[in-house]
Interface confidence: medium
């Protein structure tokens, strides 16, 4: 179920997945929620005396049991991911942090009259992930009322330092407040030849687009279908970027599909989850568990309720079926995507809906997934 | 162009920007170089502004923001709007511009081939539309020339999408069923070009459409192959008039 409480002066021991910098525990919790494997986190609001670089550290953690031993640590805040908290799921982070310099790669500096204006500039710049604004009281006159637009490979600050008269915050693209516009085009038989930031395995271009949308540095993508000539690249989704923010002219390529991230969309922004169940398809990955259920929908529901499950394969092969149902294999991987996709007539595969926003139906007890 | 991408310099060397210089100077329409002294464009570009002296024509340009008052431009010597064009009806949306002085051809500024009359039934598969127009219905003109590849739509199918309007045989339609890629405001008069048998041909002149890039609403273009006789006749009669008035 949903565990939203925070534990003050508590640090979870072990289970480390990744460490990043975040300005507060709420932002750390968000980062954990949208990380494919993170279930628990610990945030250091105060630094240990000899380790000043650990202040603002956000330590993302996982656990097979869903819990980790707690140790007392002054100034630490710990908690759970909100992966199973439906209505509380939002990547949007509107808070402004006074007296903090969130550092990253500064790619633009301009004069603005207010923090709001600076945040808007960041929100409306394709590359901007976070910003720092120097107020009119900042100690260096030449930087006063300056708005620094920033980015990093992780989408989060590379370090955070307390500095008087600096104010920092995040782009509001994830709040659907960007005015950049939203190119919905899907280009059949076209490939973009731009810089790859990552690659994942996906069953179709639409899942590829959603993965791109929620990747911090993906601006557009090219997906190679199952008919693609190079076997190792079949069902591979290449996440791409470019300096200009726009793709170079696409190359005509049979069995390639290209498109744009929807992270600047206001209305058409997708949820970070994939509803479709793919029949005749098997998703490979690390086996978490196998149960016997009746139907692929029930398998998806089981995966969704199993917090660590990221995707599943339901097999209708005679040897995989019993009286109580057929085999539902619950799986996971490091990036949340299958490690390989194969085509098997008797299989159906899909994804956990743990990151979908759910709405309570007023007249029935079951949760309806809002699509 | 909605759903397009940036072009590179010299990629579409026949594309020109038609601009109006009144109080300020603004890009109004596109056009295509078809000869040293000739630009082919849409008649509707001149609705309400049929005064040759306010128009400036820029060729060999990729980025409109780089145009300054020092940038060379061509002026209109003669504006020939199709005699049957009526502003309110959309047919015969074609115009020829004769330039004051002939253009120098370079790798960034050269003509596009016209189709032949026999090409009225040719099936084109690799077609592109270009322009500096809006990238969405409620947008603004772009600095960098945009391009998009777009499939042609048979006239019968196009007519079904536009029940309120008549799609004549002098029109050609192009667009995706699902929308998303199309010409838009400011692309008017510009080229719809198709590569056929290894060479680019001017198949259409951007004319009109219901909004831009809407689902089931293809762009409508003036079909150039239907006007080959008109184009040649106008160019020829202009040459003859020039000979009559020359001081020789």
């Amino acid at each position: 179920g949903c565990l939203s409480q925070l534990y003050a002066n508590t640090f979870f021991r072990g289970g480390d997945l990744a460490a990043i910098y975040t300005p507060d525990a709420q932002h750390c919790q968000k980062m954990c929620t949208f990380h494919p494997r993170c279930l628990l986190f610990s945030f250091l609001a105060v630094s240990p005396t000899k380790e000043t670089d650990k202040r603002f550290g956000c330590f993302m953690k996982e656990s097979i049991t869903g819990t980790l031993p707690r140790i007392h640590r002054t100034g630490a805040i710990s908690g759970h991911s909100l992966k199973q908290c439906g209505h509380q799921l939002s990547a949007c982070h509107q808070d402004i942090y006074e007296g903090l310099d969130m550092r990253g790669s500064n790619f633009n500096i301009s004069k603005t009259d207010s923090i709001e204006e600076c945040q808007k500039l960041c929100t409306n710049n394709i590359h901007c992930q976070f910003f720092t604004y120097a107020t009119k009281a900042f100690h260096r006159p030449e930087y006063r009322k300056s708005c620094l637009l920033k980015r990093s490979s992780s989408g989060t600050p590379t370090s955070i330092k307390p500095v008087d008269n600096l104010v920092s915050g995040f782009s509001l693209k994830s709040c659907a407040l960007s005015e950049i516009g939203c190119p919905m085009d899907i280009f059949q038989h076209f490939a973009f030849a731009d810089l790859n930031v990552s690659q994942v395995v996906t069953p179709d271009a639409f899942v590829c687009r959603t993965v791109c949308t929620f990747h911090p540095n993906c601006l557009f993508f090219t997906f190679y279908t199952n008919e693609w000539e190079t076997e190792s690249q079949r069902n591979v989704c290449f996440l791409k970027t470019s300096k200009s923010g726009r793709p170079s002219p696409p190359i005509i390529q049979e069995n390639a599909v290209s498109g744009y991230s929807l992270f600047t969309c206001r209305k058409a922004r997708p949820e970070p989850c994939h509803f479709k169940i793919y029949s005749g398809v098997a998703f490979e990955g690390e086996e978490l568990n196998a149960t016997f259920v009746q139907g692929a929908d029930a398998c998806q529901e089981t995966c969704t309720k199993t917090i660590r499950c990221q995707f599943f394969t339901y097999s209708l092969l005679p040897q995989d079926c019993k009286a109580e149902g057929c085999k539902c294999s619950l799986r996971l991987s490091t990036d949340g995507s299958p490690t390989r996709i194969t085509y098997e007539a008797q299989g159906s595969s899909g994804y956990s809906l743990r990151l979908c926003k759910v709405v309570e139906s007023s007249d029935c007890t079951t949760k309806i997934n809002a699509r | 162009i909605v759903g397009g991408t940036n072009s590179s310099l010299g990629e579409w060397p026949w594309q020109v920007s038609l601009q109006v210089k009144l109080v300020s100077q603004n890009h109004m329409c596109g056009g295509s170089i078809i000869g040293r002294q000739w630009i082919l464009t849409a008649a509707h570009c001149f609705d309400g502004i049929p005064y040759p002296d306010v128009w400036r024509i820029y060729g060999g340009i990729l980025n409109l923001s780089e145009i300054t008052n020092k940038t060379p431009f061509s002026s209109i010597k003669e504006l020939i709007i199709h005699q049957k064009y009526k502003m309110s009806e959309g047919s015969y949306d074609i115009a020829l511009i004769k330039l004051q002085t002939p253009l120098n051809y370079t790798e960034f500024q050269k003509p596009i081939c016209l189709p032949s009359k026999a090409d009225t039934n040719t099936i084109y598969t690799n077609c592109w539309v270009t322009g500096w127009g809006y990238t969405k219905e409620r947008g603004e003109t772009q600095n960098i020339l945009q391009k998009a590849t777009i499939p042609l739509v048979p006239n019968e199918e196009c007519q079904k999408k536009y029940r309120d309007y008549v799609i004549t045989k002098q029109m050609i339609c192009a667009g995706y069923k699902e929308g998303g890629i199309d010409a838009c405001k400011g692309d008017s008069g510009g080229p719809l070009v198709c590569k056929h048998s290894g060479r680019w041909q001017l198949v259409g002149i951007t004319s009109w459409g219901e909004g831009c890039a809407r689902k089931e609403q293809p762009g409508v273009y003036t079909k150039v192959a239907e006007y080959i006789d008109w184009i040649l006749e106008k160019i020829q009669s202009s040459k003859e008039r020039a000979l009559e008035t020359s001081p020789a």
Epitope: - | M87, G90, E137, C184, T206, W208, G219
Partner: antibody
Framework: EVQLLESGGGLVQPGGSLRLSCAAS????????MIWVRQAPGKGLEWVSY????????TYADSVKGRFTISRDNSKNTLYLQMNSLRAEDTAVYYC???????????????????WGQGTLVTVSS | DIQMTQSPSSLSAFVGDRVTITCRAS??????LNWYHQKPGKAPKLLIY???RLQSGVPSRLSGSGFGTDFTLTISSLQPEDFGNYYC?????????FGGGTKVEIR
Amino acid sequence: EVQLLESGGGLVQPGGSLRLSCAASGFTFSAYSMIWVRQAPGKGLEWVSYIRPSGGRTTYADSVKGRFTISRDNSKNTLYLQMNSLRAEDTAVYYCARGGLLLWFRELKSNYFDYWGQGTLVTVSS
Amino acid sequence: DIQMTQSPSSLSAFVGDRVTITCRASQPIDNYLNWYHQKPGKAPKLLIYAASRLQSGVPSRLSGSGFGTDFTLTISSLQPEDFGNYYCQQSYTVPYTFGGGTKVEIR
């Protein structure tokens, strides 16, 4: 020569109904959008309703929505405005106008009114 | 709805004077702006469409300009037949709305 001639106006009691007609000539009526615009005595112009060439799409001002219906008969070159539940504030001269198809800058919009009729007066009073 | 504000509401000028009427939209409307002239007891007549394009048959002493929210109609040399009311109208979005009008009188 383009001509538009309105008829059907007159005195009507609040809550009553009236049907205005606009006879068109001198142009291909079925190719144009048509519009009704009204003008209360001593006041400015107010757009009332709009209909596409085929009659397939209509729009109304909020002040008349649900009470007025625009329609056309392309075979008779006539535009209509059926006005029900009339109120005192509907008192005005009603003009029909032709929408110019603005085939301009790659946009097709009926968004200016290039020819107008002389108008017909509708008075709603008890 | 988009509000259209015209100014001045009335003016009086001599024949031969240059007259300027302004129209402001409550939100940007691109160049979707038209100007009409109406004489007392008569139907309105289209003068300018798309902010700056002159309707055929309209004398060239009239001109229009503007983009976004601010527009002007200029009569370079006022003539006796130019008296009456002038209205701007936006066609950016339904409901199409008119300005309140400017009454032009000849002194």
